[in-house]
């Protein structure tokens, strides 16, 4: 009696169970009563990453430098190429099909988390006692200068964008 289901890594065809092709290989011909499944390795720049019965291998992803992409990991016959972004850029999606420039944190904001190839810069407002006077993708908020430790007094209050201005003690009013 012909089988209705096959074991793992097999497929049912013409009422018989044939072996699937292993990762890195494509199907040339199905098995018969007398012959095994015939498989062939994927060509250069091609891959198949599962046990399969595909008759064509997939093309490796192309990391297009015009989109800011570069190869992070070269593909093999069993794996696709992994793209990442050039320095200073990050992927627009999980699939990393294109890149955008890292965001800079405006004055008054500091970098909470530096961008990576897959995530943008995370900025946060500088709290009272800290400031940032630059637009930067790397700089954290800086603490205000402590005038007291320099035996000076605050002449002008700091803001989230400016440091305090210290001055001599003798200007006390």
């Amino acid at each position: 009696e012909p089988p209705t289901a096959c074991r793992e890594k097999q497929y049912l065809i013409n009422s018989q169970c044939c072996s699937l092709c292993q990762p890195g290989q494509k199907l040339v011909s199905d098995c018969t009563e007398f012959t095994e499944t015939e498989c062939l390795p994927c060509g250069e720049s091609e891959f198949l990453d599962t046990w399969n019965r595909e008759t064509h291998c997939h093309q490796h992803k192309y990391c297009d430098p015009n989109l800011g992409l570069r190869v992070q990991q070269k593909g093999t016959s069993e794996t696709d190429t992994i793209c990442t972004c050039e320095e200073g850029w990050h992927c627009t999606s999980e699939a990393c099909e294109s890149c955008v420039l890292h965001r800079s944190c405006s004055p008054g904001f500091g970098v909470k988390q530096i961008a990576t190839g897959v995530s943008d810069t995370i900025c946060e407002p500088c709290p009272v006692g800290f400031f940032s006077n630059v637009s930067s993708a790397f700089e954290k908020c800086h603490p205000w200068t402590s005038c007291e430790t320099k035996d000076l007094v605050v002449q002008q209050a700091g803001t989230n964008k400016t440091d305090v201005v210290c001055g001599p003690q003798d200007r006390l009013r």
């Epitope: 500091g110 709290p127 402590s146 007094v153 605050v154 803001t159």
Partner: antibody, heavy 122, light 113 residues
Framework: QVQLQQSGAELMKPGASVKISCKAT????????IEWVKQRPGHGLEWIGE????????NYNEKFRGKATFTADTSSNTAYMQLSSLTSEDSAVYYC???????????????WGQGTLVTVSA | DIVMSQSPSSLAVSVGEKVTMTCKSS????????????LAWYQQKPGQSPKLLIN???TRESGVPDRLTGSGSGTDFSLTISSVKAEDLAVYYC?????????FGGGTKLEIK
Amino acid sequence: QVQLQQSGAELMKPGASVKISCKATGYTFSTYWIEWVKQRPGHGLEWIGEILPGSGSTNYNEKFRGKATFTADTSSNTAYMQLSSLTSEDSAVYYCARSYYTYDQGSWLAYWGQGTLVTVSA
Amino acid sequence: DIVMSQSPSSLAVSVGEKVTMTCKSSQSLLYSGNQKNYLAWYQQKPGQSPKLLINWASTRESGVPDRLTGSGSGTDFSLTISSVKAEDLAVYYCQQYYSYPYTFGGGTKLEIK
């Protein structure tokens, strides 16, 4: 110990100005920010601004800029807040408070005066 | 400006009960540079000035009983009184000191049944 003594209640006419005082004792007056806070029934607490007596440096809540003016006299350890062009909206209790202030941290209000009631009425 | 919202606006509890009041901010009060939450709690008893209870969201001022506990991080904070006493009758305010202008919540009035 730290104490802040405020001037007494004031009954003022609309359009007038009033100057409230806050005398500090028990610490080095010039080096800590003095905060000013407004409290109206049903309006909770509102921060007006702050002054550092040693230099006269100030920060104002934009809402009160032009309404409140802060000054300080280090010889008498007294901070002042002047409120101008008074209207009924300015009727409130006004508190001075000393912030707990260090340069790499934020500022909470550690010590409070007893409050000054300002009533604006024709 | 950072908006501070407190709830409930009032509540009545019996002596000995546990009570929790909340405070929410319109933006995070947690600064990653020092991992501190820029939030304070104050108690104002009838006819008195406000009194500082807690700073940095959870640090009790000296002399504040340990039945008062501040907790929370980011935008959500709470003040818990584990066993209410008659002397706790007051309005409780939260305040952010992350950025100018400093702002207060509208207060929670604690009444004793």
